[in-house]
């Protein structure tokens, strides 16, 4: 079905359209049950309740209503370039016999959760497989979704972005069963250049693809590792040229700062990956802000003048909760001739594997 | 309807910093990106970048990363652009747009005059 | 960043003529391609977005095509009021623009 909400212009800013399905555990006399249901034809937006966002707000929100006291709320939020469902929450009424018969107690309950819909800004987001958002002894399932918040003129944008689940997946392989991790592993990250400049001319050349690995611990007490890959298209890099420090500053999606330091030894004349530092936000967690650093490493190391290369994947440790997994790596600091790289020096890891 | 009135023209000296406003009305002020371009006649049309004034999130070009900053009050639904260090080349006209990325529904300021001379 | 080349930096054209311009971005922009008039004195002016969307009001004698990286803007029954400044813009990733192509009418 298709629910829109609309401003006082008679403006739409939220357009969806799909069918949902609710999975709900409770408890009858004889003891627990689960009731599945779909959402009704009859479902309607809650006008009153439903927002386009106030002044000075950002959080237009749809509210769905039905049978007897139902509501599937979604809540929005976003970014300077994404947006994104932040909140799902569904509130039901075990007093509703028609849903929930034998229900021993007749109280209304809600249950929220965050979830993965979100979409760059002026695309739709678009889902045909079911998206599954799992609430305490609720299960939402949307099919067949087609959702887009802050609309320009009132229609569903020609471009979209897709769901993780609908995208190919590079290797067919059996179902998993669903896995309490917010996000699925994703694939290896795209390799990028990067380069920072000085007024003495480059003083960083790098290519690499870069995954963070994070742990930490979310609302609901769980603990969750989530690894998420840098994406280069939305991402812009900087940097500063030191005698003794080089530095490459990434600002990707989410507010996300990934900051890498190499440092040299003048003795020996060798460069190396020195410190690296994160700040980035987690919506999930139970301290959303989430920030690692370490300025004590040893990494990527290679005589000035000559560039490290490593095809294989390298785990840099940074803390206890968080690594970065480099891909193809290929990088030179401090010395850098003709803004090309130098003579390779190759990892152990590739030359084990010749 | 949707209107940017931006601050009016400026005369400043190399080295300097200029701060230039841009207060929007006739829509919810943190709906949408504001971006800034500047137009001059030796280099053109260049983006510099874009604040969302819901949470202060502010992309910038590379090229203007390290001299602009974005800022945006909610309060009075005005968004400002500091540059600084400034040289005779940053002599054009700069305007904010009303976008979030797609550009079909974009509404263009009047354009701020910055000229840099000793 | 994504860089668009534009070419050429200038071209001149007779009254009822044809000119055509290309933008080429440095990676795949997914049709996110718009393109603007420019005239001194004045703001610039929305003609083509999508890649081949007209802006309405603007007259069928503008038109605009391409996929990937490869793009191109059309002018055609040229008309004096044609002179000025056209800059091609790519939206997919940030905002980039051309560097923009001075036309002249012979």
């Known amino acids: 079905a298709m629910f829109i909400v609309k401003n006082g212009n008679g403006t739409a800013c939220i357009m969806a359209n799909f069918s949902a399905a609710f999975s709900v555990n409770y408890d009858t006399k004889s003891g627990p049950k689960n009731m599945t249901f779909d959402l009704p034809s009859d479902a309607k937006v809650v006008l009153n309740s439903s927002s386009c966002g106030k002044e000075n707000t950002s959080d237009p929100s749809l509210v769905i209503a039905f049978g007897r006291g139902q509501t599937l709320t979604l809540n929005f939020t976003r970014n300077a370039t994404r947006y994104s469902v932040q909140l799902m929450s569904f509130v039901y009424n075990l007093s509703d016999t028609h849903l929930f018969p034998n229900a021993s107690s007749k109280e209304i309950k809600t249950v929220e959760s965050i979830t993965d819909i979100r979409a760059d800004i002026d695309k739709k987001y678009r889902c045909v497989s079911g998206t599954q958002v799992h609430m305490n002894n609720v299960t939402v399932t949307l099919h067949d979704a087609t959702i887009q918040a802050y609309l320009s003129n009132s229609s569903f944008s020609r471009e979209e972005t897709r769901c993780e689940q609908d995208r190919p997946s590079p290797t067919t392989a059996p179902p998993a069963p669903p896995s309490p991790s917010p996000s699925p592993v994703p694939e290896s990250p795209s390799v990028d250049k990067y380069n920072v400049s000085g007024t003495n001319g480059t003083c960083l050349l790098a290519s690499m693809g870069l995954q963070l690995n994070l742990t930490y611990e979310r609302k609901d007490n769980t603990t969750v590792t989530r690894l998420l890959n840098i994406n280069p298209n939305k991402t812009l890099a900087s940097g500063s040229c030191g005698a003794h420090l080089v530095t490459l500053e990434l600002h990707s999606e989410g507010s996300t700062v990934l900051l890498f330091q190499f440092g040299m030894n003048a003795s020996s004349s060798r460069f190396f990956l020195q410190g690296i530092q994160l700040n980035t936000t987690l919506p999930d967690a139970r301290d959303p802000a989430f920030k690692a650093a370490n300025s004590s490493l040893r990494a990527l190391q290679a005589t000035v003048g000559n560039s490290y290369k490593c095809n294989a994947e390298e785990h840099v440790r940074v803390t206890k909760a968080f690594s970065v997994n480099i891909f193809k790596v290929w990088v030179q600091a401090f010395k850098v001739e003709g803004g090309q790289f130098g003579s390779v020096e190759e990892c152990l890891l590739d030359e084990n594997n010749m | 309807q949707v209107q940017l009135v931006q601050s009016g023209a400026e005369l400043v000296k190399p080295g300097a910093s200029v701060k230039m406003s841009c207060k929007a009305s006739g829509y919810i002020f943190t709906n949408y990106n504001i971006h800034w371009v500047k137009k001059s006649p030796g280099q053109g049309l260049e983006w510099i970048g874009a604040?969302?004034?819901?949470?202060?999130?502010?992309p910038y070009s590379q090229k203007f990363q390290d001299r602009a900053t974005l800022t945006a009050d909610t309060s009075s639904s005005t968004t400002y652009m500091e540059l600084s260090s400034l040289t005779s080349e940053d002599s054009a006209v700069y305007y904010c747009?009303?976008?979030?990325?797609?550009?079909?529904?974009?509404?263009w300021g009047q354009g701020t005059l910055v000229s840099v001379s000793s | 960043d994504i860089q668009m080349t534009q070419s050429p930096p200038s071209l001149s054209a007779s009254v009822g003529g044809k000119v055509t311009i290309t933008c080429k971005a440095s990676?795949?922009?997914?049709?996110?391609m718009a393109w603007y008039q420019d005239k001194p004195g004045k703001g610039p002016k929305l003609l083509i977005h999508?890649?081949?969307t007209l802006q309405p009001g603007i007259p069928s004698r503008f038109s605009g095509s391409g996929s990937g990286r490869d793009y191109s803007f059309s002018i055609s029954n040229l008309e004096p009021e044609d002179i000025a400044t056209y800059y091609c813009?790519?939206?997919?990733?940030?905002?980039?623009f051309g560097g923009g192509t001075k036309l002249e009418i012979k």
């Open positions: 747009v009303r976008a979030n990325w797609d550009v079909a529904f974009a509404y």
């Open positions: 990676q795949d922009i997914d049709r996110y």
């Open positions: 813009l790519q939206y997919d990733n940030l905002w980039t």
């Open positions: 604040i969302y004034p819901g949470n202060g999130d502010a």
């Open positions: 999508d890649t081949s």
